[in-house]
């Protein structure tokens, strides 16, 4: 079957996101990938979206993330814009209303996004072959 247009949009957004280094990409998020053995794909997407939403809700107006320079300010705003887009698309792909995120493990946002990108690329290669 054809790859979902949403999947392509997610990969494009992740490509942009993983190129970015901002003051806050080193902050930690819940690592939902650490123990995702018994988790369905839809649950993984839902939980990833939940983690991203928690992150940008908490840090969107964080003065440490906004920084002191115009470049830092705009890079952070761009990061938040991309995270919101990613969140929206992941919810669309998951098709679930809510999902628990209880893991204790943490990873940096940067590593979280890299891991998510790997998963999405694997999914894309399967559906496009």
């Amino acid at each position: 079957h054809k790859c979902d247009i949403t999947l392509q949009e997610i990969i494009k957004t992740l490509n942009s996101l993983t190129e970015q280094k901002t003051l806050c990409t080193e902050l930690t998020v819940t690592d939902i990938f650490a123990a995702s053995k018994n988790t369905t794909e839809k649950e993984t997407f839902c939980r990833a979206a939940t983690v991203l939403r928690q992150f940008y809700s908490h840090h969107e107006k964080d003065t440490r993330c906004l920084g002191a320079t115009a470049q830092q300010f705009h890079r952070h705003k761009q990061l938040i814009r991309f995270l919101k887009r990613l969140d929206r698309n992941l919810w669309g792909l998951a098709g679930l209303n809510s999902c628990p995120v209880k893991e204790a493990n943490q990873s940096t946002l940067e590593n979280f996004l890299e891991r998510l990108k790997t998963i999405m690329r694997e999914k894309y290669s399967k559906c496009s072959s």
Epitope: S16, E19, Q20, A68, T69, A70, Q71, F73, H74, R75, K77, Q78, R81
Partner: antibody, heavy 123, light 107 residues
Amino acid sequence: QVQLQQSGPELVKPGASVKISCKASGYSFTSYWIHWIKQRPGCGLEWIGMIDPSDGETRLNQRFQGRATLTVDESTSTAYMQLRSPTSEDSAVYYCTRLKEYGNYDSFYFDVWGAGTLVTVSS
Amino acid sequence: DIQMTQSPASLSVSVGDTITLTCHASQNIDVWLSWFQQKPGNIPKLLIYKASNLHTGVPSRFSGSGSGTGFTLTISSLQPEDIATYYCQQAHSYPFTFGGGTKLEIK
């Protein structure tokens, strides 16, 4: 081509309110911040503030805090600036301009400007 | 706020001259500086961004240099159409600020 079209000149009484517009065309309106600049006759340029058309977030120069309000109408790709209780000091040309960025803000600058709106405050 | 100081305030020039305009920032702004040209009754026109990058369509006789707190705009072999006021603008931090301008006048 990329354009910012501003509304015409305004004659406003001291203490009244004036709202000027800036209509964008030729590019994705929500992708670039719109900034507003003031220029008094024979004087230099002063940054008023900026607005993100994608979500309406604004940032203002403290000198204009509480007096200038920046808004956008995404449906018409138009940015607005409202000045409350203007005085003769607010008689000026007001420009809107787009902040263009490259490579995730590796560089950014004002590349396109509106023609300016002359606001005259007089009783 | 970062103060931007331009010198001289005005300059008498002749066609063919090579001239240098200076801009000083009150604190380190790295290379976050733009130069604009404005002719009477016209809008400001971007010449240089990020201290030394020539904007698209701007003649190569314009060049910018500097970093930190000191910047220069050089116009080599000045043309009649270059008679205008030149402004520097810092894009390092908000609020963005402009210099007071340097006005060129024909001798």
